[in-house]
């Protein structure tokens, strides 16, 4: 971007380079050949986070109960409230407008990576020795029980929806 | 009080350069933009693009943006507005204004004429 | 571009007349309005900038109103001295634009 006529931190207008606003104020009037810009801090649900020649603030993001959110950090007069979601739940989206259910990994599947306030649950296909007989959103693929180490023999395969079955070895005569 | 004075007349062949100058005088000379502005013989005026001489900073007026090269000096407090490739359309008179909430002070013009 | 309609282009009136010019924006330009006077073979002068507020060493009987994009400048009484092609300027946004001009001339 090549410089322009104002400074950084400066706006034109009217052929003449006026501050902008500093982070957490907005604009009440431009300067004069005369005067500063005159600005006034926002109040205290608004915030503005950029150096600015906006004429109003920005309302807080309201972390609304009823959507599942709850505010994860409170806005101040220059950043916005931060929402994340209760417990269980994730955003739907980038922007956190709601929140759903954390998703359960079914049979056969287990978590790869538990859910978060803002990712849902990541689930993986139980891989050969690994079983998962439940829907959950949070047991991993468990492996199958070595019926060798218990000295027992393999009496019905495993699946990776159901663990080996063991038994007792048939004893030569 | 504020003065601008420009350059004298200038007779340019087309595909040429012109460089007109504009010297302040009665304020401080980086405390305020300097404007161009051009009028063809019988028009408006149209706005030609804007420089601070405190930064060297400027932006142009997109219709002539690859021609137009503004510059400010500020030793001698003078402003300089080149332009070219001159075509026949370019004839105008060139004016250059202090801002500062409007073009509040200009000069008496800069008439470029070009002719083959 | 942010055009600037001037009305009328031209107009003729006696000393003493009350004269009154238009300028239309297409979009909304706050007050960053402004008005120029070119009199043949004079430099130009800023009569009013900011819409309303009369630049120094002006006259008091020009005067300025309007916001947004409907502006009207006045010369309560015209005098001889007035005649001249009177532009309007917005300085909202770049480009900086011209309305056309009015030539106000003595009946």
């Known amino acids: 971007e090549p410089p322009t006529a104002c400074r950084e931190k400066q706006y034109l207008i009217n052929s003449q380079c006026c501050s902008l606003c500093q982070p957490g104020q907005k604009l009440v009037s431009d300067c004069t050949e005369f005067t500063e810009t005159e600005c006034l801090p926002c109040s205290e649900s608004e915030f503005l986070d950029t150096w600015n020649r906006e004429t109003r603030c920005h309302q807080h993001k309201y972390c609304d109960p009823n959507l599942g959110l709850r505010v994860q950090q409170k806005g101040t007069s220059e950043t916005d409230t931060i929402c994340t979601c209760e417990e269980g739940l994730h955003c739907m989206s980038e922007s956190c407008e709601s929140c759903v259910p954390h998703r359960s990994c079914l049979p056969g599947f287990g978590v790869k990576q538990i859910a978060t306030g803002v990712s849902d649950t990541i689930c993986e296909p139980c891989p050969v020795g690994f079983f998962s007989n439940v829907s959950s959103a949070f047991e991993k693929c468990r492996p199958w029980t070595s019926c060798e180490t218990k000295d027992l023999v393999v009496q019905q395969a495993g699946t990776n929806k159901t663990d080996v079955v063991c038994g007792p070895q048939d004893r030569q005569r | 009080q504020v003065q601008l004075v420009q350059s004298g007349a200038e007779v340019k062949k087309p595909g040429s350069s012109v460089k007109v100058s504009c010297k302040a005088s009665?304020?401080?000379?980086?405390?305020?933009?300097i404007e161009w502005v051009r009028q063809a013989p019988g028009q408006g005026l149209e706005w030609m693009g804007v420089?601070?001489?405190?930064?060297?900073?400027?932006n142009y007026n997109e219709k002539i943006k690859d021609r137009v090269t503004l510059t400010a000096d500020k030793s001698t407090s003078t402003a300089y507005m080149e332009l070219s490739s001159l075509r026949s359309e370019d004839t105008a008179v060139y004016y250059c204004?202090?801002?500062?909430?409007?073009?509040?002070?200009w000069g008496q013009g800069t008439l470029v004429t070009v002719s083959s | 571009d942010i055009q600037l309609t001037q009305s009328p282009s031209s107009l003729s009136a006696s000393v003493g007349d009350r004269v009154t010019i238009t300028c239309r924006a297409s979009?909304?330009?706050?007050?960053?309005l402004n008005w120029y006077q070119q009199k043949p073979g004079k430099t130009i002068k800023l009569l009013l900038n900011f819409a309303s507020r009369l630049h120094s060493g002006v006259p008091s009987r020009f005067s300025g109103s309007g916001s947004g994009t409907d502006f009207t400048f006045t010369i309560s009484s015209l005098q001889p001295e007035d005649i001249a092609t009177y532009y309007c300027?917005?300085?909202?946004?770049?480009?900086?634009?011209f309305g056309g001009g009015t030539k106000v001339e003595i009946k």
């Open positions: 420089i601070n001489p405190g930064s060297g900073g400027s």
């Open positions: 979009q909304d330009i706050s007050n960053y």
């Open positions: 300027q917005q300085g909202s946004t770049l480009p900086w634009t």
């Open positions: 204004a202090r801002g500062g909430g409007g073009f509040t002070y």
């Open positions: 009665g304020y401080a000379f980086s405390d305020y933009l």
